[in-house]
Interface confidence: medium
Amino acid sequence: TLNSVLINSNAIKNLPPPLGGAGGQPGSAVSVAPGVLYEGGNKYQTLDNYQPYPCAEDEECGSDEYCSSPSRGAAGVGGVQICLACRKRRKRCMRHAMCCPGNYCKNGICMPSDHSHFPRGEIEESIIENLGNDHNAAAGDGYPRRTTLTSKIYHTKGQEGSVCLRSSDCAAGLCCARHFWSKICKPVLKEGQVCTKHKRKGSHGLEIFQRCYCGEGLACRIQKDHHQASNSSRLHTCQRH
């Protein structure tokens, strides 16, 4: 069962309940397990149980994590996958989701995906399936690994609400974030906007409405006047470094 479910959004005011058949696991209705976080009206409610979060796809993990087996060769076919910390710049990767926000996977290395680095028409990154071993992450876990080949196919960047696979598909000021069962371009958060801070591993779960990260020069921190509030209702906002 899922360890946690988190529902949040950039703009969604009417959040469906985290259960009620809205989301599920393969072959079953979703069931709440310990560690549920549910954001409604900017209040977080949490139940304590911080275990590594099992996942089936990258989108179930936080924006600073990806889904894979915990250690090389630790899991065979059908082995448990968990959310692992993203890889920083210049670290080895096999797909975009492995790289931390602001980076993408190019030639097996996490590179900055700064919009200024791309020509106006943006380089399309074709996804190819690669079943080879990922020597820096999990190998032999039975799941296809994605890597990229860059081909100079120029296209317009996705506007807000456009379908996307990764943030580099979106126009400047937007990121690619989960929205129900797909991903769309959403605005990068501005100063003062509510953000999602995954403080501890396993505390987030599937973000049905995923927020973008804070914009340049901003960090997701507890809002000052919320310091006195209990752990379960601390509000995070994008603030200047």
């Epitope: 950039n10 703009a11 969604i12 005011k13 009417n14 959040l15 469906p16 809205a22 989301g23 599920g24 696991q25 393969p26 979703v30 089936a56 796809e57 989108e59 179930e60 996804i127 506007q159 807000e160 609400g161 456009s162 379908v163 696979l165 929205h179 129900f180 069962w181 797909s182 991903k183 769309i184 371009c185 599937l206 049905i208």
Partner: antibody
Framework: QVQLVESGGGLVQPGGSLRLSCAAS????????MSWVRQAPGKGLEWVSG????????YYADSVKGRFTISRDNSKNTLYLQMNSLRAEDTAVYYC???????WGQGTLVTVSS | DIQMTQSPSSLSASVGDRVTITCRAS??????LHWYQQKPGKAPKLLIY???NLQSGVPSRFSGSGSGTDFTLTISSLQPEDFAVYYC?????????FGQGTKVEIK
Amino acid sequence: QVQLVESGGGLVQPGGSLRLSCAASGFTFSSYGMSWVRQAPGKGLEWVSGISGSGSYTYYADSVKGRFTISRDNSKNTLYLQMNSLRAEDTAVYYCARHYMDHWGQGTLVTVSS
Amino acid sequence: DIQMTQSPSSLSASVGDRVTITCRASQDISNYLHWYQQKPGKAPKLLIYGASNLQSGVPSRFSGSGSGTDFTLTISSLQPEDFAVYYCQQYDSIPMTFGQGTKVEIK
């Protein structure tokens, strides 16, 4: 180009079952969420169900919850809708669609009648 | 559930006319709104996504505007192939819901 082709529709008695299929091509199927949408004869559009790219997460309209099951086989680039306990009001053209309906199939007609 | 109300339910217009269709959501849906065109016996075709973005391959005479609860689809100069039914659809929350449709007929 993106292509979605539905099949499996037909005439079925109330209480019966039917399984719809949607064959996808022209895009990386496993990377996209998919939906089923239906349209009763002469009526408007109704979203039925959605599923994430890996198939791990599913979503249903209240009108079909507990009776319909959405699934996918990414190795076959195919989306499914298993429909059980069918009712007369389920009669409609069923469309499969990519993402939030940015591309649609041509539809398959399901008629529930005795 | 979010109710989507389109107006008018039908309209008659001539080729070259400027046509405006409105869609109102029962609650704030930000810009999570699509506009579709559907012709008889065909699947709907996405025209506008994210309330105001033109889908690739759609003629520029189509435009969308609005945010929150009130949205508009405008056809700047109606062409013969534009006579069809138009639907709005919100994707802000589950269940995703459509407007009842606006039929654009030849005057």
